[in-house]
């Protein structure tokens, strides 16, 4: 039975040209956490953290994607195009697959405002 | 049934390199991640790197850094594994070994290679 | 990284025997941990992971336990065909590490 929650950024926004940290957080499980996927809004993979074998980010981004902090994901350099959703995927045994979503909108504006309050979706 | 076949034994130089490699025979690399052990004579086990070959990343052990780089052909579906530098202290058995990704990632390394046979003499 | 250190290095037994294996990590590994047996000039085959789950085709007599920083890998009766070494490996952590082994011979 999946007793566990993800809790994530929600609804966040950056200043082009800036950083923004992505971040989801699995609670009320005792479940391992085997590996976390991050996926963009078309669904194709940023990066993977495995237990065992470390961070792994896809070569296209390995130059605006840093891992962490912990199982979060730092997107660098942004860029309009980086406006979108994310999903941050946990695979865990025995429960089986969460998934959090995060809506990321990169603003033109120098005073955008950089919200982060966790919010479960 | 998916095996992994690796490349026949070695004997090398000190100072040499040696490239192993180890083909996937029946399946594809696709949702898995290949491990490199290596075990010397009368020895445990020991872990040496990791490619995740959707990706082509690969991450190593402190102790092999700089000296060994792993690499993958998805479209052939092999694995290799190249030591450089290399010194007595080398000789050993190498293996490749499967990895599940996501889903399955609670797996340990599942599949095995045969094992290639390194030996450094001069 | 990670040590592991298993206990004893290596046993005697006779079929039917009741053998217990056991595996300490220099920290807490949760059930982030596998056990491998190993026959002389063969690979590894994984037996357990997740500190206690059986792998497909692995015989029942085979059970693993524990958590955090204490594991067991227990045979409940000895088989000719189990006499091997066994390795312990955690998992928690980049980059694995395994035990230095226990080799289970004939008594």
């Known amino acids: 039975m999946m007793t566990g929650t993800i809790e994530t950024t929600g609804n966040i926004s950056a200043k082009k040209g800036g950083s923004v940290i992505l971040q989801c957080h699995l609670s009320s499980t005792m479940a391992q956490v085997t590996q976390v996927n991050w996926e963009q809004h078309d669904h194709s993979l940023l990066a993977i953290r495995n237990a065992e074998l470390g961070w792994h980010i896809y070569p296209a981004f390995k130059d605006r994607v840093a891992p962490g902090p912990g199982l979060g994901l730092t997107l660098q350099s942004l860029t309009m195009n980086d406006t979108g959703e994310y999903f941050c995927t946990y695979h865990t045994y025995p429960d089986g697959t969460y998934r959090g979503r995060i809506f990321l909108e990169v603003l033109e504006s120098s005073v955008a405002e950089h919200s982060a309050r966790f919010q479960i979706p | 049934q998916v095996q992994l076949v690796q490349s026949g034994a070695e004997v090398k130089k000190p100072g040499s390199s040696v490239k192993v490699s180890c083909k996937a025979s029946g399946g594809t690399f696709q949702n898995y991640a290949i491990s490199w052990v290596r075990q010397a004579p009368g020895q445990g086990l020991e872990w040496m790197g990791v490619i995740v070959p959707i990706f082509g990343t690969a991450n190593y052990a402190q102790k092999f850094q700089g000296r060994v780089t792993v690499t993958a052909d998805e479209s052939t579906s092999t694995a290799y594994m190249e030591l450089s530098s290399l010194r007595s202290e080398d000789t050993a058995v190498y293996y490749c070994a499967r990895l599940h990704l996501g889903q399955k990632a609670y797996y340990g390394m599942d599949v095995w290679g045969q094992g290639t046979t390194v030996t450094v003499s001069s | 990284d990670i040590q592991m250190t298993q206990s004893p290095s290596s046993l005697s037994a006779s079929v039917g025997d009741r053998v217990t294996i056991t595996c300490r990590a220099s920290q807490s590994i949760s059930s982030y941990l596998n056990w491998y047996q190993q026959k002389p000039g063969k690979a590894p085959k994984l037996l357990i992971y997740?500190?206690?789950s059986l792998q497909s085709g692995v015989p029942s007599r085979f059970s693993g336990s524990g958590s955090g920083t204490d594991f067991t890998l227990t045979i409940s009766s000895l088989q000719p065909e189990d006499f091997a070494t066994y390795y312990c490996?955690?998992?928690?952590?980049?980059?694995?590490?395994f035990g230095g082994g226990t080799k289970v011979e004939i008594k």
């Open positions: 490996q955690q998992r928690y952590v980049f980059p694995p590490t």
């Open positions: 997740a500190a206690s």
